[in-house]
C-alpha cells in the first residue's frame, strides 16, 4: 500500500524540513525563515514556536524541528514541552494566587516550589521528635521514647499534623 | 494568533506616574487571570500584580503595594498597569502575561507573554 501510495502522491516524497507546495505542480519547497515540519509528505509548515516574555528559548527552531523553551531565573517550566513558567517562591513558602506566602504553622516546603506538606507526625511510627520542623524543614524523627535512655528527655512532639493551607492573610 | 503587545513604558523621574497597557487578541480575553511580570537588569524575574477574571480580585507583590493598581477593560480586551510613586528599583522589562487554563487551581503558570515595555526610572 505505501508503494502505492508514493507512486500515486508525490507529496509522499518530500522530506522533513520541505512541504508539497500545491501552487507549484506539488513541488517539495522548503519551509519558508520562522517555521518548520518534522516529517515528510506534509503540504504546510507548521509555525515556530517563540520563547517569549519570561520564555527563554533552549533550542532554535529548525526547518525540521521546532524551537524549545525554558523560563528565565525567578520562573520555572510548568506542562509538557514548558507551556508554562509559574513563578518560584522561597523555600518555607508556597504559591497562591496572592503571591508566595509563608508556610502555616506544622507546615514545610523544602522547594521552590509546590504547596507545605505537614510535618512527619513522629509519634505515629512509635518513635519520638529528634529535630523540631521549621516552614524549610520537616521534623527529624529519632529512637522511640521507650528507647531512650532513662532520665534523657526528647523535644515535645507537635501538633498533630494539619491539611497543608495557606497563611491567613 | 494568541497575541500579547504591551506599551506606555518610558522614562520617568523618581515619585512620577506612569501607565502601561497589554492589548489581547486571538482568544477570549474575559475568560482568563492576566498578569504583571517584571525583569529588572541582572536580575531574576518577579511577579508584580494579577486579576482574575471579571476584575473583582486583584492581587500584588508586597514592593508595589499601594503604589500600583492594576485593572483589565474586557470590552477593549485590554490590561493595565497604573504606577505610581516610581521609585529607581522599578526600572525593569515590564510583561503582560496570561494566567493558563488552570490557573488559581494550585497552578499558577502563564502561557501567553508580551514582548515586554521597557520602565525606566531615573533623575
Known amino acids: 500500500f505505501e508503494r502505492t501510495r508514493s507512486l500515486q502522491d508525490p507529496c509522499s516524497n518530500c522530506p522533513a524540513g520541505t512541504f508539497c507546495d500545491n501552487n507549484r505542480n506539488q513541488i517539495c519547497s522548503p519551509c519558508p525563515p520562522n517555521s518548520f515540519s518534522s516529517a515528510g509528505g506534509q503540504r504546510t509548515c507548521d509555525i515556530c514556536r517563540q520563547c517569549k516574555g519570561v520564555f527563554r528559548t533552549r533550542k532554535e527552531c529548525s526547518s525540521t524541528s521546532n524551537a524549545e523553551c525554558d523560563c528565565t531565573p525567578g520562573f520555572h517550566c510548568l506542562g509538557a514541552g514548558c507551556s508554562m513558567c509559574e513563578q518560584d517562591c522561597k523555600q518555607g513558602q508556597e504559591l497562591t494566587k496572592k503571591g508566595c506566602k509563608d508556610c502555616c504553622f506544622g507546615t514545610f516546603n523544602d522547594q521552590k516550589r509546590g504547596i507545605c506538606r505537614p510535618w512527619t507526625n513522629c509519634s505515629l511510627d512509635g518513635k519520638s521528635v529528634l529535630v523540631n520542623g521549621t516552614k524549610e524543614r520537616d521534623v527529624v524523627c529519632g529512637p522511640s521514647p521507650a528507647d531512650l535512655s532513662p532520665g534523657a528527655s526528647s523535644v515535645t512532639p507537635p501538633a498533630p499534623a494539619r491539611e497543608p493551607g495557606h497563611s491567613p492573610q | 494568533e494568541v497575541q500579547l503587545v504591551e506599551s506606555g513604558g518610558g522614562l520617568v523621574q523618581p515619585g512620577g506616574s506612569l501607565s502601561l497597557s497589554c492589548a489581547a487578541s486571538?482568544?477570549?480575553?474575559?475568560?482568563?487571570?492576566m498578569n504583571w511580570v517584571r525583569q529588572a537588569p541582572g536580575k531574576e524575574a518577579e511577579w508584580v500584580a494579577n486579576?482574575?477574571?471579571?476584575?473583582?480580585?486583584?492581587y500584588y507583590v508586597d514592593s508595589v503595594k499601594g503604589r500600583f493598581t492594576i485593572s483589565r477593560d474586557n470590552a477593549k480586551n485590554s490590561l493595565f498597569l497604573q504606577m505610581n510613586s516610581l521609585r529607581a528599583e522599578d526600572t525593569a522589562v515590564y510583561y503582560c502575561?496570561?494566567?493558563?487554563?488552570?490557573?488559581?487551581?494550585?497552578?499558577?503558570?502563564?502561557?501567553?507573554w508580551g514582548q515586554g515595555t521597557t520602565v525606566t526610572v531615573s533623575s
Open positions: 486579576i482574575n477574571q471579571d476584575g473583582s480580585e486583584k
Open positions: 486571538g482568544f477570549t480575553f474575559r475568560s482568563f487571570w
Open positions: 502575561a496570561r494566567g493558563g487554563p488552570d490557573y488559581g487551581d494550585l497552578h499558577y503558570g502563564m502561557d501567553v
